[in-house]
Each structure stands twice: as structure tokens, then as C-alpha cells.
């Protein structure tokens, strides 16, 4: 799903207030709901009719440092016999997410939000066009 | 997928530097890759064998203000005849994402990261347990 543009109004102070100095804002330390956890069914990536693999990207200057991307294993979907059925399509499900980018020069550290496109998994769909009968 | 705990080390300055004053950091205005867009297949939520609906939650003090949650429509999956097959299971695919929470008291505005659990879509899986024969 798409994150709308900021238009930078979200990060501005009310008009009646003095502007933010130096184009930066105050970000409080700590993360709300930090202990909240993903609780998905077990091994859905291999049990799905549109199975996928995970690839981990790592960047120490990004939070979270680890971003996991899914890649659909097949073009078609897996049928009840465990065979690929190319009359159906495996398609990725994508999500825009925010990460925090750390920028430092010596002891001067600042942070900036960054939009990242994550493929979260795959789903099996009826094709729009039947290339294959 | 799960966002690891910060351990707050990510937001700390190097040990040789003076600590961050008042438990806050500098967040630069603007978003990197703001124009990046999701490019998913059309209407996958209704074409999927595990179809889903979207619900939008809105909060003006959150960025993004709009967070979209998916809910699977069926317990089973939709077969080639368009009927629900309860020998297969529709399951949600979840993703932890970051949002920014705005907190203001008069002209004093600060921001804090918040972890949100988003259901991005659904996929069809072979069941672990057969509730129904």
C-alpha cells in the first residue's frame, strides 16, 4: 500500500509558532509499541500455493538494519498435486514502509526518514490475460 | 516480518562523543525516496484465491496518517469454480512497519517512532491442522 506524500505539513509547527530551526525536528528516543510482535502462521512461505523465499538486506546505518524481502518462487501456483499450474499466477504483495537513515559526520549525528518498498509475500491470482490456454 | 529491538544503540552517538541532550535527536525534514511507489498487479485483493478487503484507519497525528489493513474474506480459498474450498486455508500476511507519532504542547512539537502491525494481504496455504475433513 502507498504512503502519501508528506507535503511537509505534518512536520511543520502551527503557523502561529516560530519555524523549525535549521530544517530539523526533535525526534524522541525510544519506540512506541516496540515489543509488539508479528504473529503469522507457521511456515506460510512454504505452505502457500504461491510460495516465496526470503532475502535479508543489512545496513548498519538504517533502522531497522535488517529488511527482509520476499521473492515468489514460481510464475504459476502450486496445485493440490504439488505441481506448478501456469493457468494461475503467483504475484508479490508489496508494502511501502518507513525506515530511519542515520547520517553522521564525526560527533554530529542526524536522522532522516526513508521510504522503502518491501515485498512481504505472494498470493495466487487468476490472471488478467491468459497467455497460456 | 519482525523489526528487531533498537536497544537504543542505533540512536546513540559514538562513545567518544557527548551524549544526546534531553533524550532526543535531530530528525531532518524531508523523506528519502518519497516518490517511490508500490507497483502491484491490479485488483489482486479480489483476484486472489485468498481474497481480502481493505480497512483504512486515519490519525492526523501519525505519519502516514492513513494506515490500510487487510482482512481475509474467507476461511477457505476460492477454487477454479469460484467456490470456497475449506480443505485449504486463507491466512493473513503481516508486516511490522514504522510510523511517526506527532506530540505537541502548544508550539513545542516533537516526534517519536511507533511500531505498527499491518496485515498486507492474504495467501492460500495447505492446512497444518485439518479442522474439517
Amino acid at each position: 500500500r502507498k504512503i502519501p506524500k508528506v507535503g511537509h505539513t505534518f512536520f511543520q509547527k502551527p503557523e502561529s509558532c516560530p519555524p523549525v530551526p535549521g530544517g530539523s525536528m526533535k525526534l524522541d528516543i525510544g519506540i512506541i509499541n516496540e515489543n509488539q510482535r508479528v504473529s503469522m502462521s507457521r511456515n506460510i512461505e512454504s505452505r502457500s500455493t504461491s510460495p516465496w523465499n526470503y532475502t535479508v538486506t543489512w545496513d548498519p546505518n538504517r533502522y531497522p538494519s535488517e529488511v527482509v524481502q520476499a521473492q515468489c518462487r514460481n510464475l504459476g501456483c502450486i496445485n493440490a498435486q504439488g505441481k506448478e499450474d501456469i493457468s494461475m499466477n503467483s504475484v508479490p504483495i508489496q508494502q511501502e514502509t518507513l525506515v530511519v537513515r542515520r547520517k553522521h559526520q564525526g560527533c554530529s549525528v542526524s536522522f532522516q526518514l526513508e521510504k522503502v518498498l518491501v515485498t512481504v509475500g505472494c498470493t495466487c491470482v487468476t490472471p488478467v490475460i491468459h497467455h497460456v490456454q | 516480518r519482525k523489526i528487531p529491538k533498537v536497544g537504543h544503540t542505533f540512536f546513540q552517538k559514538p562513545e567518544s562523543c557527548p551524549p544526546v541532550p534531553g533524550g532526543s535527536m535531530k530528525l531532518d525534514i524531508g523523506i528519502i525516496n518519497e516518490n517511490q511507489r508500490v507497483s502491484m498487479s491490479r485488483n489482486i485483493e479480489s483476484r486472489s484465491t485468498s481474497p481480502w478487503n481493505y480497512t483504512v484507519t486515519w490519525d492526523p497525528n501519525r505519519y502516514p496518517s492513513e494506515v490500510v489493513q487487510a482482512q481475509c474474506r474467507n476461511l477457505g480459498c476460492i477454487n477454479a469454480q469460484g467456490k470456497e474450498d475449506i480443505s485449504m486455508n486463507s491466512v493473513p500476511i503481516q508486516q511490522e512497519t514504522l510510523v511517526v507519532r506527532r506530540k505537541h504542547q502548544g508550539c513545542s512539537v516533537s516526534f517519536q517512532l511507533e511500531k505498527v502491525l499491518v496485515t498486507v494481504g492474504c495467501t492460500c496455504v495447505t492446512p497444518v491442522i485439518h479442522h474439517v475433513q
Epitope: S39, M40, S41, I44 | N53, T55, T57, Q69, A70, Q71, C72, R73, N74, L75, G76, E84, I86, N89, S90, V91, P92, Q94, L117, T119, V125, P127, V128, I129, H131, V132
Partner: nanobody, 123 residues
């Protein structure tokens, strides 16, 4: 914490009927299914029926198929279990719960249950 309140149980003769209801205080944004479960004395808790909030399709355990009917009222965040042709072996405490993964939900996925409602079927 989500609260679940089950009601409608009671003592009934074999062949009789009862209608259970369950109110869930807060549906999770992604929560899409509800289930009824039961636990007879000295036995493990077992699945009885499930329903999708959106699609409204229900599925049943073989032991209750054709006798029990599950329905839901989205506006009231309430699910029902109409139990007909009751048998002594239906005697148990009946619980409802959110099924976060639909039929893929296992008993291990739950960390909270309501108080349940006792159903006793005499012969």
C-alpha cells in the same frame, strides 16, 4: 486485552436446543474470523465451528455438522452458535475466540480465553 463474553448455556434434555452468543470487545484490525471451541471435563479443548466476519461462511467439526449453525452480527461484534438435536456428548464448557489465522489457528496461538458458558445435556 480483548474481552470475550460467552452466554446462553444451560441444562437441556437430549434432542433439545440452545443458542449461545459471544461478544468480543475489540476486533483486531486484521482479525477476520471467530471460532467456537469446547472442553469437556477431563478432555482437551476442541474446535467446534468458525465463521468469517466478512464472507460469513462457516465451517464445522464433523461431530456437530448438520446440528449446529454459527452466525455473526458484525455491527454488534457478536457471534452465535445455534445448537439443535443436542446429545449428551455435547456436554462441555463452550468458549469463543478470535481466530487470527482463520482455520490455520492452533490452540497454541491463544494466550487468552473468556470464562466460557456451560452446556449440560442430560439423557
Amino acid at each position: 486485552q480483548v474481552q470475550l463474553v460467552e452466554s446462553g448455556g444451560g441444562l437441556v434434555q437430549a434432542g433439545g436446543s440452545l443458542n449461545l452468543s459471544c461478544v468480543i470487545s475489540r476486533r483486531t484490525p486484521s482479525g477476520y474470523a471467530m471460532g467456537w471451541f469446547r472442553q469437556a471435563s477431563g478432555k482437551e479443548r476442541e474446535f467446534v465451528a468458525a465463521i468469517s466476519w466478512i464472507g460469513g461462511g462457516a465451517v464445522y467439526a464433523d461431530s456437530v455438522k448438520g446440528r449446529f449453525t454459527m452466525s455473526r452480527d458484525n455491527a454488534k461484534n457478536t457471534v452465535y452458535l445455534q445448537m439443535n438435536s443436542l446429545k449428551p456428548e455435547d456436554t462441555a464448557v463452550y468458549y469463543c475466540n478470535d481466530m487470527p489465522y482463520g482455520l490455520d489457528t492452533t490452540m497454541d496461538d491463544y494466550d487468552y480465553w473468556g470464562q466460557g458458558t456451560q452446556v449440560t445435556v442430560s439423557s
